[in-house]
């Protein structure tokens, strides 16, 4: 299965300020905030699927170190 990009460092913008482990980089405000303040992907029970129109992101395809919760502290830069 394809995986998303693993970092927010890229050619179009300077690297964001690294966040501490419990924080995630919020692109809209461009600084680190507690990850709990952002709607990070949550694992779904096996076999569960979201009905349209509320289709959730697939945690296993989100950026991050592994499957499951896969909430990436974006500037943590794995």
């Amino acid at each position: 299965m394809r995986r998303g990009p693993r970092s927010l460092r890229g050619r179009d913008a300077p690297a964001p300020t690294p966040c501490v482990p419990a924080e995630c980089f919020d692109l809209l405000v461009r600084h680190c905030v507690a990850c709990g303040l952002l709607r990070t992907p949550r694992p779904k029970p096996a076999g569960a699927s979201s009905p349209a129109p509320r289709t959730a992101l697939q945690p296993q395809e989100s950026v991050g170190a592994g499957a499951g919760e896969a909430a990436l502290p974006l500037p943590g830069l794995l």
Epitope: R2, G4, P5, S7, L8, R9, G10, R11, D12, A13, A15, P16, C24, F25, D26, L27, L28, V29, V33, G36, L37, L38, R39, T40, P41, R54, T55, A56, L57, S62, V63, A71, L72, L74
Partner: antibody
Framework: EVQLQESGPGLVKPSQTLSLTCTVS????????WNWIRQHPGKCLEYIGY???????YYNPSLKSRVTISRDTSKNQYSLKLSSVTAADTAVYYC????????????WGQGTLVTVSS | DIVLTQSPATLSLSPGERATLSCRAS??????????MNWFQQKPGQAPRLLIY???NRATGIPARFSGSGSGTDFTLTISSLEPEDFAVYYC?????????FGCGTKVEIK
């Protein structure tokens, strides 16, 4: 399972204020971004704005002078007010929320049609 | 604002055929190594449904026949073999910066 449900009058008179509420279940509006989007009949989707986890707001500059988005965290609801409406504001209004970290709107309400007419 | 232009406006195809939809942005939607381009499907009377996020990642429950590609300013949504339920309007949307903007859609209709 996150669910969003719009509610409010389906008919508003010209020059009055359109008021809609989005009730959220399955997640707290003190986390994430909570948006309003509208779609004119048979036309494109237009982004209105958001209220964030902190209560800060962003309004599309094209509508900024007429828009207010607020929230009631005790009811887990957020609201849209659009003042001085005209027939051009007739549209289906959606509330929606993007996930992190891609800010892709994966949760949507079913939409509510608001007609501006006298 | 970032303007998204979709083409063609209408695509007339038969079930089983391949659909290729294009979306071009007025400026790059890439940031931090991610393409902030998303694709939605909308059927009459329904809300948009997220199909693809970050240019190429399928959302939960979306069949493998849907795929997305592209980076920078040029993006493509491909439906490898159209099923009857795929006839709908498809929108691209950028989430690189606010105001988030949408294309005006490509209608995939039955030929």
């Amino acid at each position: 399972e996150v669910q969003l449900q719009e509610s409010g009058p389906g008919l508003v008179k010209p020059s009055q204020t359109l008021s809609l509420t989005c009730t959220v279940s399955g997640d707290s509006i003190t986390s994430g971004y909570w948006n309003w989007i509208r779609q004119h009949p048979g036309k494109c989707l237009e982004y209105i704005g958001y209220i964030s986890y902190s209560g800060s707001t962003y309004y599309n500059p094209s509508l900024k002078s007429r828009v207010t988005i607020s929230r009631d965290t005790s009811k887990n609801q957020y609201s849209l007010k659009l003042s001085s409406v005209t027939a051009a504001d007739t549209a289906v209004y959606y509330c929606a929320s993007p996930n992190y970290p891609f800010y892709a709107m994966d949760y949507w309400g079913q939409g509510t049609l608001v007609t501006v007419s006298s | 604002d970032i303007v998204l232009t979709q083409s063609p406006a209408t695509l007339s195809l038969s079930p089983g055929e391949r659909a290729t939809l294009s979306c071009r942005a007025s400026e790059s939607v890439d940031n931090y190594g991610i393409s902030f381009m998303n694709w939605f499907q909308q059927k009459p009377g329904q809300a948009p449904r997220l199909l693809i996020y970050a240019a190429s990642n399928r959302a939960t429950g979306i069949p493998a026949r849907f795929s997305g590609s592209g980076s920078g300013t040029d993006f493509t949504l491909t439906i490898s073999s159209l099923e009857p339920e795929d006839f709908a309007v498809y929108y691209c949307q950028q989430s690189k910066e606010v105001p988030w903007t949408f294309g005006c859609g490509t209608k995939v209709e039955i030929k």
